[in-house]
């Protein structure tokens, strides 16, 4: 009887986990593409709030701007370089700090996707309607978990949510 109740409890827990991570491909292009909030979502939101994604934003921004290096000194208005970097900090240091922050999401694919979406949204203001730079940023973001040694979210629609 005890064994049966433990089995039921385990099955119940599995169902909760499964429902918390179910993807809804039919959700509209505005708003989250994941199912309605659950306990898992609340936990993810708390994790996202606690995380400092700034190193990731700066790392991605620098990677994208490096691609556009030929345009560098054309516009004095452009702020670039070490804007979010600590003195003496290399790109590698910044990438490591980013990976350390993403580490908290590595066991939650849905939450990792939301973290990547948040980075994209927070940095999209920088490139605005420059589609080539935005595409480059999406490519860099898709590679980010893998570069950190984590599993990439398999179905993560980065640009589906509207940031502002």
């Amino acid at each position: 009887m005890v064994k049966l109740s433990i089995l039921v409890a385990l099955l119940g827990a599995l169902l909760v986990v499964a429902s918390a991570t179910r993807w809804d491909p039919d959700r509209g292009s505005r708003g989250s593409r994941w199912d309605a909030p659950s306990r898992g979502d609340d936990q993810c939101q708390r994790q996202l709030q606690r995380a400092n994604l700034r190193p990731c934003e700066e790392h991605i921004r620098q990677r994208v701007e490096k691609e556009q290096e030929q345009e560098q000194d054309e516009y004095p208005y452009i702020q670039r370089g070490s804007r979010g970097q600590r003195p003496g900090e290399s790109d590698e240091d910044q990438e490591q700090r980013c990976c350390n922050e993403l580490n908290r999401f590595q066991n939650n694919q849905r939450c990792m996707c939301q973290a990547l979406q948040q980075i994209l949204q927070n940095q999209s203001f920088r490139f605005q309607q420059d589609r080539s730079q935005l595409h480059q940023m999406e490519r860099e973001l898709r590679n980010l978990p893998q570069n950190c040694g984590f599993r990439s979210p398999s179905r993560c629609d980065l640009s589906s949510r509207t940031p502002y």
Epitope: S29, R30, E71, E74, Y75, Y77, I78, Q79, L120, Q121, S124, F125, R126, F127, Q128, Q129, D130, R131, S132, L134, S159, S160, R161, T162, P163, Y164
Partner: antibody, heavy 121, light 107 residues
């Protein structure tokens, strides 16, 4: 709510210069691109280009390089279009339009009311 | 530059008619297409973005379809307030362009 308010109509002589202003409100100005669109009398819409309000970098469409300058004053959420050496062919309504982001990227959901510029001697 | 060609350039229709306007790009633009409505003396009004997404507040009688080079704007049942000029606009390349416009007039 989002609003783009443009400066009033202008009557200019050929060879003169002019500046159209576009005052943005109801959103964070530096988060969205500002586009400029021209419409000559009885004609269609012509995209002139855009300015990145975060970096100040302008992009000009072909046919709008040289005499046309996009600029910003982010402290007052203003975008400007300056045209020098005005010609009769510059007579048109000039619109500013906010560029949308991510899902709606590539479209203009918010427009100024338009500024009529007449170039005549 | 990518050329956008709209057809027809003008059409006459009655209230309640189903109206279809097409827009053809000179090369593939994926789904980077928007549709606008403009009335005389007014700024354009966004109807559809990303080829088929209805802009918030736009009546559901408007719909967009297509991808690649061929796109369609459909008004399922024309209303008196729909008599206007319609423009398509591509944002695939660095330089964006509008179609020449389609004027929808009362028959």
């Amino acid at each position: 709510q989002v609003q783009l308010v443009q400066s009033g109509s202008e009557l200019k002589k050929p060879g003169a210069s002019m500046k159209v202003s576009c005052k943005a409100s109801g959103y964070t100005f530096t988060n969205y691109a500002m586009n400029w669109v021209r419409q000559a009398p009885g004609q269609g819409l012509e995209w002139m280009g855009w300015i990145n309000t975060n970096t100040g970098k302008p992009t000009y469409a072909q046919g709008f390089t040289g005499r046309f300058v996009f600029s910003l004053d982010t402290s007052v959420s203003m975008a400007y279009l300056q045209i020098s050496s005005l010609e009769a062919g510059d007579t048109a309504v000039y619109f500013c339009a906010r560029g949308e982001s991510l899902a709606a990227l590539g479209s203009f959901a918010y427009w100024g009311q338009g500024t009529l510029v007449t170039v005549s001697s | 530059d990518i050329q956008m060609t709209q057809s027809p350039s003008s059409l006459s229709a009655s209230v309640g008619d189903r109206v279809t306007i097409t827009c053809r790009a000179s090369q593939s633009i994926n789904s980077y297409l928007a549709w606008y409505q403009q009335k005389p003396g007014k700024a354009p009004n966004l109807l559809i973005y990303a080829a088929s997404n209805l802009q918030s507040g736009v009546p559901s009688r408007f719909s967009g379809s297509g991808s690649g080079t061929d796109f369609t704007l459909t008004i399922s049942s024309l209303q008196p307030e729909d008599f206007a000029t319609y423009y398509c606009q591509q944002s695939s390349s660095t330089f964006w362009t509008f179609g020449q416009g389609t004027k929808v007039e009362i028959k």
